[in-house]
């Protein structure tokens, strides 16, 4: 059974994941982002079901494409480069989903834009956090 300290750690990790996903979304949605139109042409796979931590496998599998789209910004002036954000997200996702069991991700038939994709995973984090508090 999960202890209160492990639940607290999971909650903190989910909060950090949520914050970085929101930061990416904010950067994309920024009205000054000249590459937004092009970014929206890229399609992302959405999970058929995302209700448990093991479903983060579906996010992990899309992190490389996410980084590639973020690199379109081609700014020489990053506080944080896309790879910094994606690397941190990857570490958190690996810790949250665990590596004991191998879960085969099932994707929905419809693909999504980067904005829809990020919003889906933001909602996932918020949902899981709400069950822990």
């Amino acid at each position: 059974a999960p202890t209160s300290s492990s639940t607290k750690k999971t909650q903190l990790q989910l909060e950090h994941l949520l914050l970085d996903l929101q930061m990416i979304l904010n950067g994309i949605n920024n009205y000054k982002n000249p590459k937004l139109t092009r970014m929206l042409t890229f399609k992302f796979y959405m999970p058929k079901k995302a209700t448990e931590l093991k479903h983060l496998q579906c996010l992990e599998e899309e992190l490389k494409p996410l980084e590639e789209v973020l690199n379109l910004a081609q700014s020489k002036n990053f506080h944080l480069r896309p790879r910094d954000l994606i690397s941190n997200i990857n570490v958190i996702v690996l810790e949250l989903k665990g590596s004991e069991t191998t879960f085969m991700c099932e994707y929905a038939d419809e693909t999504a834009t980067i904005v829809e994709f990020l919003n889906r995973w933001i909602t996932f984090c918020q949902s899981i956090i709400s069950t822990l508090t």
């Epitope: 994941l17 914050l19 970085d20 996903l21 904010n26 920024n30 506080h79 944080l80 954000l85």
Partner: nanobody, 119 residues
Framework: EVQLVESGGGLVQPGGSLRLSCAAS????????MGWYRQAPGKGRELVAA???????NYADSVKGRFTISRDNAKNTVYLQMNSLKPEDTAVYYC?????????????WGQGTQVTVSS
């Protein structure tokens, strides 16, 4: 409006350590990047290290393995632990606050704190 107050600068010998702090107050947005930049005499301002509210970090190559950035989201404070300091680390260190990960959209800068590494 966000206010940034830096502290911890000073004079230190080569090989020594310092810990800088930057406390943000005012209209703080929970999703942000806080970081440290520095400007040596006659040079441009350069990134030292930055950290997101989610814990993503970025370091300048020249400080990797020597400097560590961390933050306390509850206190809206960012820290820079500087070890194995070198004379070339001498500069004014500025705290930065941004709601985006793009540097050219930095919202606020601190006043700066002087770090001098000299024997």
């Amino acid at each position: 409006e966000v206010q940034l107050v830096e502290s911890g600068g000073g004079l230190v010998q080569p090989g020594g350590s310092l810990r800088l702090s930057c406390a943000a107050s005012g209209s703080i947005f929970s999703i942000n990047v806080m970081g440290w930049y520095r400007q040596a005499p006659g040079k441009g301002r350069e990134l030292v290290a930055a950290i997101s509210s989610g814990g993503s970090t970025n370091y300048a190559d020249s400080v990797k393995g020597r400097f560590t950035i961390s933050r306390d989201n509850a206190k809206n404070t960012v820290y820079l632990q500087m070890n194995s300091l070198k004379p070339e680390d001498t500069a004014v260190y500025y705290c930065a606050y941004a709601s985006s990960f793009y540097e050219d959209e930095t919202d606020y800068w601190g006043q700066g704190t002087q770090v001098t590494v000299s024997s």
